[in-house]
């Protein structure tokens, strides 16, 4: 698994650099996660097809993975803070299901989808820190979480192939557009 | 072979629009992120706009915003850039180019450059 | 939009020189940071990404350094084919370019 931020040899290296602003530390956590992603998504394009697919909208039937679109505010036209801050939070409390899911599938990489799945939640709790109207954030339901793995971890491998790589490309295109939109904060 | 073909410049009077189209090969723009970026005649390198293929989110400089749309055609592997009320300030060769990585870290593959002329 | 300042804005060496371009950021952008080359009538090549990481086949004489809000670029031997214009560039957000540096022959 990758060093968590703030453990990186730079930091190591320069110990009397600044400490990192709330900004910046959330900025690299979405990188780690990022970073995370990138090794669990070679593990799922190598062992099969999946990236090269064409099938993927089968599998997408089955999920409601959260995207960002131009009503969140998140985008440059029309950028509002605090309606995309809680959009991202809402978000990655939505992903949270979908991180558990994958927890069972992988072999190499088991280390690193847990960690991708423990930094999901530091970075909720930073950001959750920053956000000013929490509660304007809904908190998704746990028996429709359990339900909604129950059903996911039911499909046939093909399928739980595709809704793995389908949730790894989605988590890495949310935390994107969150790590662009996090900057014009 | 990854390469970028630009076509659509050319000479406009003040106040009219241009489009400029960039046809990618070698990779799909669907999954790069891609950008604009102009030189004024002995100038130097200004960027003009860039779209994260995640939503098509388009991002603009200041001296562009509200006149210049970034856009994208994924079935032809295409890019573009609008250009309305156009000033004699836009004129200079417009580069599109590839932004390299997940995270955009530099410029990793460059259009040959169109010349943009905003002239009565 | 971040506002990069370069400086100097132009540069008078001779080949063998050990040459520095520093460039600032107006906010803080971690280490998002390219340097480019630019000769007359062609598109600029990346030298360095992420302040300090050297470009595939790029000669190790360029170096970069820097992060936050300054950075350098260093050239500690100057070579004739060296002799352009330089630009900085930041991608933390946008992709705003520094006013770039002409290094010419002295």
């Known amino acids: 698994a990758p060093v968590p931020p703030g453990e990186d040899s730079k930091d190591v290296a320069a110990p009397h650099r600044q400490p990192l602003t709330s900004s910046e530390r959330i900025d690299k956590q979405i990188r780690y996660i990022l970073d995370g992603i990138s090794a669990l998504r070679k593990e799922t394009c190598n062992k099969s097809n999946m990236c090269e697919s064409s099938k993927e909208a089968l599998a997408e039937n089955n999920l409601n993975l959260p995207k960002m679109a131009e009503k969140d505010g998140c985008f440059q036209s029309g950028f509002n803070e605090e309606t995309c801050l809680v959009k991202i939070i809402t978000g990655l409390l939505e992903f949270e299901v979908y991180l558990e899911y994958l927890q069972n599938r992988f072999e190499s990489s088991e280390e690193q989808a847990r960690a991708v799945q423990m930094s999901t939640k530091v970075l909720i709790q930073f950001l959750q820190k920053k956000a000013k109207n929490l509660d304007a954030i809904t908190t998704p339901d746990p028996t429709t979480n359990a339900s909604l793995l129950t059903k996911l971890q039911a499909q046939n491998q093909w399928l739980q192939d595709m809704t793995t790589h389908l949730i790894l490309r989605s988590f890495k295109e949310f935390l994107q557009s969150s790590l662009r939109a996090l900057r014009q904060m | 072979e990854v390469q970028l073909v630009q076509s659509g410049g050319g000479l406009i009077q003040p106040g009219g629009s241009l489009r400029l189209s960039c046809a990618a090969s070698?990779?799909?723009?669907?999954?790069?992120?891609m950008i604009w970026v102009r030189q004024a005649p002995g100038k130097g390198l200004e960027w003009v706009s860039d779209l994260y293929y995640y939503a098509g989110d388009t991002y603009y400089a200041d001296s562009v915003k509200g006149r210049f749309t970034m856009s994208r055609d994924i079935s032809k592997n295409t890019v573009y850039l609008q250009m309305n009320s156009l000033r004699a300030e836009d004129t200079g060769v417009y580069y599109c180019?590839?932004?390299?990585?997940?995270?955009?870290?530099?410029?990793?593959?460059w259009g040959r450059g169109t010349l943009v002329t905003v002239s009565s | 939009d971040i506002v990069m300042t370069q400086s100097p804005s132009t540069l008078s060496a001779s080949v063998g020189d050990r040459v520095t371009i520093t460039c600032r950021a107006s906010?803080?952008?971690?280490?998002?940071l390219a340097w480019y080359q630019q000769k007359p009538g062609r598109a600029p090549k990346v030298l360095i990404y992420?302040?300090?990481t050297l470009e595939s086949g790029v000669p190790s004489r360029f170096s970069g350094s820097g992060s936050g809000t300054d950075f350098t670029l260093t050239i500690s031997s100057l070579q004739p084919e060296d002799f352009a214009t330089y630009y900085c560039?930041?991608?933390?957000?946008?992709?705003?370019f520094g006013q770039g540096t002409k290094l010419e022959i002295k």
């Open positions: 180019a590839r932004w390299a990585d997940d995270h955009p870290s530099h410029i990793d593959v």
């Open positions: 906010q803080g952008i971690s280490s998002w």
């Open positions: 560039q930041q991608s933390w957000l946008g992709g705003s």
């Open positions: 992420k302040a300090s």
């Open positions: 070698g990779f799909t723009i669907s999954s790069n992120y």
